[in-house]
Interface confidence: medium
Amino acid sequence: MEDEKPKVNPKLYMCVCEGLSCGNEDHCEGQQCFSSLSINDGFHVYQKGCFQVYEQGKMTCKTPPSPGQAVECCQGDWCNRNITAQLPTKGKSFPGTQNFHLEEQKLISEEDLGGEQKLISEEDLHHHHHH
């Protein structure tokens, strides 16, 4: 596959991909890698993947852990391989921060979005065909 014209050189990293969003792939390419843990209906849901758009990752990665969601991000090929996100220990609070409730969000597969992974709401997911 060859790029048609001069364009931005996005400096992509190879990331480990694990979870529903990955389809049959075990890796993805993005400007940041992540490892996340969320509580869904009482279950621990671990995911790994990549943010293809830097701004999207920046926002999510700066979000401090909440009791229901933790995301750890890194930059470097396969840098999320040995990272396991951890929820904050009980009693630890993060004053003055606005937590995104990412446990209500999921990642659609890169394939479905034509090569771009995006965070979308649970509501949107109901109207989206999954493999």
């Epitope: 596959m1 001069p6 931005v8 996005p10 400096k11 992509l12 990293y13 190879m14 390419e29 701004e55």
Partner: antibody, heavy 122, light 112 residues
Framework: EVQLVESGGNLVQPGGSLRLSCAAS????????MSWVRQAPGKGLEWVSG????????YYSVSAKGRFTISRDNSKNTLFLQMNSLRAEDTAIYYC???????????????WGQGTLVTVSS | DIVMTQTPLSSPVTLGQPASISCRSS???????????LSWLHQRPGQPPRLLIY???NRFSGVPDRFSGSGAGTDFTLKISRVEAEDVGFYYC?????????FGGGTKVEIK
């Protein structure tokens, strides 16, 4: 120690073809993008083409597009540059360069091979 | 394509004295990730180039601290605090923010 050794440079007539090779050692070849950079005699540096570690994405300069094809054989740790429709202005030393990461181009060109000389002349 | 313009073309310097090379890009080099991908390379006569500085000011592994890079936007500078005999040769700036990657025309550093 990371090593890159280019070969395949030769004297070729205008309109002719040549295939350059770069044998890599000392690192996990498939984990890194690679590029070809050339330098005409007594002139500056010109980036020619790049390829991701898995070989899926390729990029070319305006002068190389349509005439040159970059490829790699990760099982043999070898990078290639197939050059067709060669012109006098393609005469240069061609360097093979290791990139910073799998899909990372420029910014961190290290190391460079010693280069192979391509001369296009009748 | 982004055009990289280096000045001066040639810089005769005295051993132990400072030297400065300028590089100007035809457009800003800030990438979508916020970083500026401007590198400096050094090429001694008869040798392949070697990387000195990446992302404007980061010295590459093994590069002496007499080399420093600075700048922002479209204007960048490489400084050698005290020139040594081994520093002769050509210096090139290079942008890798946009394809195709492009180099400056080079600056020749020679001893007076």
């Amino acid at each position: 120690e990371v090593q890159l050794v280019e070969s395949g440079g030769n004297l070729v007539q205008p309109g002719g073809s040549l295939r350059l090779s770069c044998a890599a050692s000392g690192f996990t070849f498939s984990n890194y993008a690679m590029s070809w950079v050339r330098q005409a005699p007594g002139k500056g540096l010109e980036w020619v083409s790049g390829i991701t570690g898995n070989g899926i994405k390729t990029y070319y300069s305006v002068s190389a597009k349509g005439r040159f094809t970059i490829s790699r054989d990760n099982s043999k740790n070898t990078l290639f540059l197939q050059m067709n429709s060669l012109r006098a202005e393609d005469t240069a030393i061609y360097y093979c360069v290791k990139e910073r990461g799998h899909s990372w181009f420029g910014d961190w060109f290290d190391p460079w091979g010693q280069g192979t000389l391509v001369t296009v002349s009748s | 394509d982004i055009v990289m313009t280096q000045t001066p073309l040639s810089s005769p310097v005295t051993l132990g004295q400072p030297a400065s090379i300028s590089c100007r890009s035809s457009q800003g080099l800030v990438n979508s990730d916020g970083n500026t991908y401007l590198s400096w390379l050094h090429q001694r006569p008869g040798q392949p180039p070697r990387l000195l500085i990446y992302e404007i000011s980061n010295r590459f592994s093994g590069v002496p601290d007499r080399f420093s890079g600075s700048g922002a936007g479209t204007d960048f500078t490489l400084k050698i605090s005290r020139v040594e005999a081994e520093d002769v040769g050509f210096y090139y700036c290079m942008q890798s923010t946009q394809f195709p990657l492009t180099f400056g025309g080079g600056t020749k550093v020679e001893i007076k």
